[in-house]
């Protein structure tokens, strides 16, 4: 669904200030496209409130109208509120923009629950805390919506960063990032560091919190530690990747690897949870329950519904296992693994119990549309969307939440044969590619 699982999403406080970030280990990576090193003007340009999305400030039109826009690697439309709505403090007013051009075409995007619809046009767009450029981009002006905008979320639109194939109404509508690359000298690469809170935020903290960084045009080495490991983008629609193995505390789930990617596996900043296909979810939960069996939790907790609370500062992180996903590597028969902690997959929820409590929701859930590596995964890592080289990179994030005993990890290489067989081939007659709602 759009609400609660696809969106809203969570953010939180950023990691240590730049001066306190851990130094990156040297490595022997092949050269990367784009500017290397520092993108100071883009660091910490994302904000968000717990469970409600990571957003970047953008300006639209002439004179510029400032809006907060949710960063979503799981869709491909740039769409903004363009009419009054009870949950919007501001919206795009096309009539006030001298550079707005109407495309005289409508767009309708239904989700499993909820929808938005609007009118297509183009206008001048820039990102104040991004590259110093202005581009003419397609904009869907949202005139009607249901269960799309979130009360108090502080964002007024969505920036779909995936490929044209899944753009609405069809793949002829050029996505924002394609326009940006075409009209400027910016390299075809961006990277995301989403910084989860790791503890519940009260409303004051949440409003003031910094959520991370979207680096447009390259890689900022201050945002990660260790080396970057890359997995191929299987197909340019969603950011589709291939998972070849799943472990819970080092124990292999021992499933046919096709199950992990049924019917696809994607990296999606607009989804809160790590979402797994039904069979995989059931096996993973069984394994997580077994690993944490010294304590039992209510059935509704494992469904992502009930919250479990502990006295502030006493959350027993050690009883929960780590989750490792092995991703296809760039070299034949080679994979690498990314490992997340319970600090990533137990999502802090504020304002439910007392201030003496830390409360969490289980943020691994069941999917009928494949694996979705949402914020739960991304908050552990610096994720590089290297479109130019059709690959996605993962490194340990300098702002990920951990404890003194365990840390998120990106490790390799591992020898894994027949990885190509792990990809699921969607039948041509299947209409699942037309589904926008990711239930």
């Amino acid at each position: 669904t759009h609400l609660g699982i696809r969106l809203p999403l969570r953010s939180g406080l950023a990691g240590p200030p730049l001066g306190l970030r851990l130094p990156r280990e040297t490595d022997e990576e092949s050269e990367e496209p784009g500017r290397r090193g520092s993108f100071v003007e883009m660091v910490d340009n994302l904000r968000g409130k717990s469970g409600q999305g990571y957003y970047v400030e953008m300006t639209v039109g002439s004179p510029p109208q400032t809006l907060n826009i949710l960063v979503d690697t799981g869709s491909s439309n740039f769409a903004v509120g363009a009419a009054p709505h009870p949950f919007l403090h501001r919206y795009y007013q096309r009539q006030l923009s001298s550079t707005y051009r109407d495309l005289r075409k409508g767009v309708y995007v239904p989700y499993t629950q909820g929808k938005w619809e609007g009118e297509l046009g183009t206008d001048l767009v820039s990102i104040p805390h991004g590259p110093n450029v202005t581009v003419r981009a397609n904009i869907a002006a949202i005139t009607e919506s249901d269960k799309f905008f979130i009360n108090g979320s502080n964002w007024e639109g969505i920036l779909g960063l995936a490929y044209a194939e899944i753009a609405r109404p069809d793949d002829s509508l050029e996505p924002f990032f394609d326009s940006l690359v075409k009209q400027t000298h910016i390299p075809n690469i961006f990277s995301l560091q989403l910084c989860g809170a790791g503890f519940p935020l009260n409303q004051t903290e949440a409003l003031a919190s910094v959520g991370g960084s979207m680096i447009i045009g390259g890689i900022d080495h201050s945002l990660y530690t260790g080396r970057l490991w890359y997995t191929p983008i299987r197909r340019e629609w969603y950011y589709e990747v291939i998972i070849v193995r799943v472990e819970i505390n080092g124990q292999d789930l021992k499933m046919d690897c096709k199950e992990y990617n049924y019917d696809k596996s994607i990296v999606d900043s607009g989804t809160t949870n790590l979402r797994l296909p039904k069979k995989v979810f059931e096996a993973a939960v069984k394994s997580i329950k077994a690993a944490s069996s010294t304590e039992k939790f209510p059935d509704g907790f494992w469904l992502g519904e009930q919250l479990v609370c502990w006295q502030a500062g006493t959350t027993p992180w050690n009883i929960f296992p780590v989750i490792s996903l092995y991703l296809m590597g760039e070299v034949t028969n080679q994979s690498f693994r990314i490992t997340i902690l319970p600090q990533q997959y137990l999502r802090p929820v504020e304002d439910v119990a007392t201030s003496q409590d830390d409360c969490y929701k289980f943020a691994v859930s069941q999917s009928s549309t494949g694996t979705v590596m949402g914020a739960v995964i991304m908050e552990g890592f610096y994720v590089v969307f290297d479109r130019a080289r059709k690959r996605i990179g993962f490194a340990v994030s300098a702002c990920h939440v951990h404890d003194e005993f365990r840390t998120a990890a990106v490790e390799g290489p591992f020898v894994t044969a027949d990885m190509e067989d792990c990809g699921y081939n969607i039948p041509q007659t299947d209409e699942s590619t037309l589904m926008t709602g990711r239930a």
Partner: antibody, heavy 120, light 108 residues
């Protein structure tokens, strides 16, 4: 069928420790399907949750009572116990033990309760 | 903290009448809500769990409804043994800790 029975002194002096035991009969306290808990009810007032325990010894306490509460389990005797230290008159209540079932979520079976009066 | 407010505090009805009791949560508790019945000198008894499911052995005249923040316990036709105090409890936040203040159903 499974039954719960509270036992312990009915009168405790202020500043002392209240100690109660709940005996589970007709079933095993070591069942992986349940937590076991304590709830109290001051005379003429509502219900207040005190805490829960799993047979492994894992405990959860009401934050407002945590500094004074200890719940323990003795699987060999099929019992679990409550200790509440530094009691005052405000701790005078009927104390119930109960089973937390239905996916560890609901108190589906209760003991009859025992009145504990705190008075010198 | 989630606060449960029950209303009315007292409900005066005659046997055979329909009783409607309300429980309102200060924020959404999904459908994780229970209703208990307590008679004088007795322990509470679970009537309804997950907002609308009757517990084992509970007569069909008891029904629960609602989700989110507003919940209702309905007794379709009051029997003499139904005059008691009724409590709601949320278990959305676990471990379950919050009870409502109670509604007393008394004979008119």
């Amino acid at each position: 069928q499974l039954q719960l029975q509270e036992s312990g002194p009915g009168l405790v002096k202020p500043s002392e420790t209240l100690s109660l035991t709940c005996t589970v009969s007709g079933g095993s306290i070591s069942s992986s399907s349940y937590y076991w808990g304590w709830i109290r009810q001051p005379p003429g007032k509502g219900l207040e949750w005190i805490g829960n325990i799993y047979y492994s010894g894992s405990t959860y306490y009401n934050p407002s009572l945590k500094s004074r509460v200890t719940i323990s389990v003795d699987t060999s005797k099929n019992q679990f116990s409550l200790k509440l230290s530094s009691v005052t008159a405000a701790d005078t209540a009927v104390y119930y033990c109960a089973r937390l079932g239905h996916g560890y979520s609901y108190f589906d079976l209760w003991g009859r309760g025992t009145l504990v009066t705190v008075s010198s | 903290e989630i606060v449960l407010t029950q209303s009315p505090a007292t409900l005066s009805l005659s046997p055979g009448e329909r009783a409607t009791l309300s429980c309102r949560a200060s924020q959404s508790v999904s459908s994780y809500l229970a209703w208990f019945q307590q008679k004088p000198g007795q322990a509470p008894r679970l009537l309804i769990y997950d907002a609308s499911n009757r517990a084992t052995g509970i007569p069909a005249r008891f029904s629960g409804s609602g989700s989110g923040t507003d919940f209702t316990l309905t007794i379709s036709s009051l029997e003499p043994e139904d005059f008691a105090v009724y409590y709601c409890q949320q278990v959305y936040v676990w471990p379950p800790r919050t009870f409502g203040g109670g509604t007393k159903v008394e004979i008119k």
